[in-house]
Every structure is written in structure tokens, then in C-alpha cells.
């Protein structure tokens, strides 16, 4: 399970308040980090450990996710054909 | 390299109370779940305790639950095990144990048995009257 | 609890498969060369090898079974083989009794 915590504000400019968010999550056994419709999230360790990205479901609903080329990330393709690639080190 | 130093052991009395401590050095400690496993004369390899990366999460073996806690200090790399109401049972060798998956910042992740990749040298607890 | 031959034994050079079943998640396998005595993980998280482990040391998942595969073992592998996991219900942690492993 993940939660947005605010860490800090900047209240030194009453015109506008600077927020900074972090997720904190917090994973049940057999758990990993992951990213899931492109947040944050805990995912089962096996998808991690075989690769298989796209079943985490990272990308943002209605996006369709295909794995790179030895399984080294993914692709979120949107609808109207933009791609964003994220490459796991 | 991964070190993990354990201390603490010896000759314990039944119905006594002990402290183990595990040293930990090499690696980023407050990414990884931690683990203390025992070793008894009669029973092969026993999981005592684990903790999450965070020190958020702990678990214990049936043998030992209701009388050991496992914790941890992030800043000095340390995890400790206390085991109350020593029994004859309770002898054997007891090793520190670092799971391989590194934890992400704002995560807290437990261990896996399965994930040990690092093993502290062991150290010796003798419950005897 | 996790089940895993008691022996097996074998001539140098000759191929050694160990088993292992009932756990849950990831299997690891430990050696130990005497009781009481330092534990080496020799496979994590069911396939992957520590640095300093030989490449004759491999692990293999096929279901809820792990095998340890020694490829050429030698005299100095000689030893007991721990493997460990979760239990089934993945509340905590599992070991099996060990396989002792003879080099004739």
C-alpha cells in the first residue's frame, strides 16, 4: 500500500505554498518496489524478477505498454501515438 | 565487501536473558531486510526474527515468538535480537543475515529467506545451569 | 516443511542435482562444510549466483521446486546443503533438514 506524505511547505512566501510529496509505501511480504498506472507501488517480486514489466501495469490507463528489447524496460504508448520509455539499470 | 559481525553469545542461564548483536558494514544497511537464523544441536537451520529495511516490520519463528525482539539502527548499521525466558532449547549458533534486494528510498520492504546473500560468522549461546 | 534428500553422493567431475519443494516466493541454497560452522550462500533468489561462487554452482525453479545443479563437483564441495524459503503461507521463513553431499 502507498500513501502521498507531504514532507515539507515553504511558508516563507504567503503567496504561494511549495509542497514537497513523496510516496511512502509500505510492501507485504513477497513484495517489491514497482510502478503501477505510473505511480509508485508494490508489485509481486517474481514480476520483478522475470521482467515481465507490463503485468505491474506501469502505465497510465488506456496507454499500451510493451517491454524493450531484452526486457531492459517498457514503453507507454498514448492513444494518440506519443511513447514514453523507462529503462530499468 | 559485505561484513556482518555478530557478538553477544556465550553461557547463558535458563530463564535469563540475552542480547545479540549484529554488526553490519559494506553495504547500504537501511535498504535491506535483516535476518537471524539459528542453528541447534538437534534441529538444522531455524528462522528466529527478521525486520524490514525500516525497522516498521518484524516477524519471529513459533519457537521464539512472545520472547525475542528483533530491531535495528539504521545509523549504526546495527541489528539486535533479545531473547527472554532462556531455555535449554535456545542453544546453538545464531547467524546474522543480510536479503539481497536493495529497497528503494520512501519504501519498506521485508526480507525473503529465499534472497540471503550474505551470512555473519556465527555466534555461539550455551543455555545451561 | 520443505523436503530435500537427506544424501547424495558422486564421483568428481560427475554432474549433482539437488531438490528442493513446499516453500513459497524464492529459493536459496546455503553450504556448510561442518555444524556450527559458517554458512555460504552458494544460489539467491532462486537462479542468481554470488560472485565469488563458482559457475558449476546453477539453481533452477520449475513450479514450487528449486534444483541445485553442480556441474564437475569437486572434493571441495563437499559439504551440507541448506535450502531455504518461505512457507506456503508466506508468514515466515523456511529451512530445509539439508542434503549431505559425499564426493567419493
Known amino acids: 500500500t502507498c500513501e502521498i506524505v507531504t514532507l515539507d511547505r515553504d511558508s516563507s512566501q504567503p503567496r504561494r505554498t511549495i509542497a514537497r510529496q513523496t510516496a511512502r509505501c509500505a510492501c507485504r511480504k513477497g513484495q517489491i518496489a514497482g510502478t503501477t498506472r505510473n505511480k509508485p507501488s508494490c508489485v509481486d517480486a517474481r514480476i520483478i524478477k522475470t521482467k515481465q514489466w507490463c503485468d505491474m501495469l506501469p502505465c497510465l490507463e488506456g496507454e499500451g505498454c510493451d517491454l524493450l528489447i531484452n526486457r531492459s524496460g517498457w514503453t507507454c504508448t498514448q492513444p494518440g501515438g506519443r511513447i514514453k520509455t523507462t529503462t530499468v539499470s | 565487501a559485505v561484513t556482518l559481525d555478530e557478538s553477544g553469545g556465550g553461557l547463558q542461564t535458563p530463564g535469563g536473558a540475552l542480547s545479540l548483536v549484529c554488526k553490519a558494514s559494506?553495504?547500504?544497511?537501511?535498504?535491506?531486510?535483516m535476518f537471524w537464523v539459528r542453528q541447534t544441536p538437534g534441529k538444522g537451520l531455524e528462522y528466529v526474527a527478521e525486520?524490514?529495511?525500516?525497522?516498521?516490520?518484524?516477524n519471529y519463528g513459533s519457537a521464539v515468538k512472545g520472547r525475542a525482539t528483533i530491531s535495528r539502527d539504521n545509523g549504526q548499521s546495527t541489528v539486535r535480537l533479545q531473547l527472554n525466558n532462556l531455555r535449554a532449547e535456545d542453544t546453538g549458533t545464531y547467524f546474522c543475515?543480510?536479503?539481497?534486494?536493495?529497497?528503494?528510498?520512501?519504501?519498506?520492504?521485508?526480507?525473503?529467506?529465499?534472497?540471503?546473500?550474505?551470512w555473519g560468522h556465527g555466534t555461539e549461546v550455551i543455555v545451561s545451569s | 516443511a520443505l523436503t530435500q534428500p537427506s544424501s547424495v553422493s558422486a564421483n568428481p567431475g560427475e554432474t549433482v542435482k539437488i531438490t528442493c519443494s513446499g516453500g513459497s516466493y524464492s529459493y536459496g541454497w546455503f553450504q556448510q562444510k561442518s555444524p556450527g560452522s559458517a554458512l555460504v550462500t552458494v544460489i539467491?533468489?532462486?537462479?542468481e549466483r554470488p560472485s565469488d561462487i563458482p559457475s558449476r554452482f546453477s539453481g533452477a525453479l520449475s513450479g514450487s521446486t528449486n534444483t541445485l545443479t553442480i556441474t564437475g563437483v569437486q572434493a571441495d564441495d563437499e559439504a551440507v546443503y541448506f535450502c531455504g524459503t518461505e512457507d506456503i503461507s508466506g508468514t515466515a521463513g523456511v529451512f530445509g533438514a539439508g542434503t549431505t553431499l559425499t564426493v567419493l
Open positions: 559494506g553495504f547500504t544497511f537501511s535498504s535491506h531486510g
Open positions: 543475515a543480510r536479503s539481497t534486494y536493495e529497497c528503494p528510498g520512501g519504501f519498506s520492504c521485508w526480507g525473503d529467506t529465499g534472497q540471503i546473500d550474505a
Open positions: 539467491y533468489w532462486d537462479d
Open positions: 525486520i524490514t529495511n525500516d525497522g516498521s516490520g518484524t
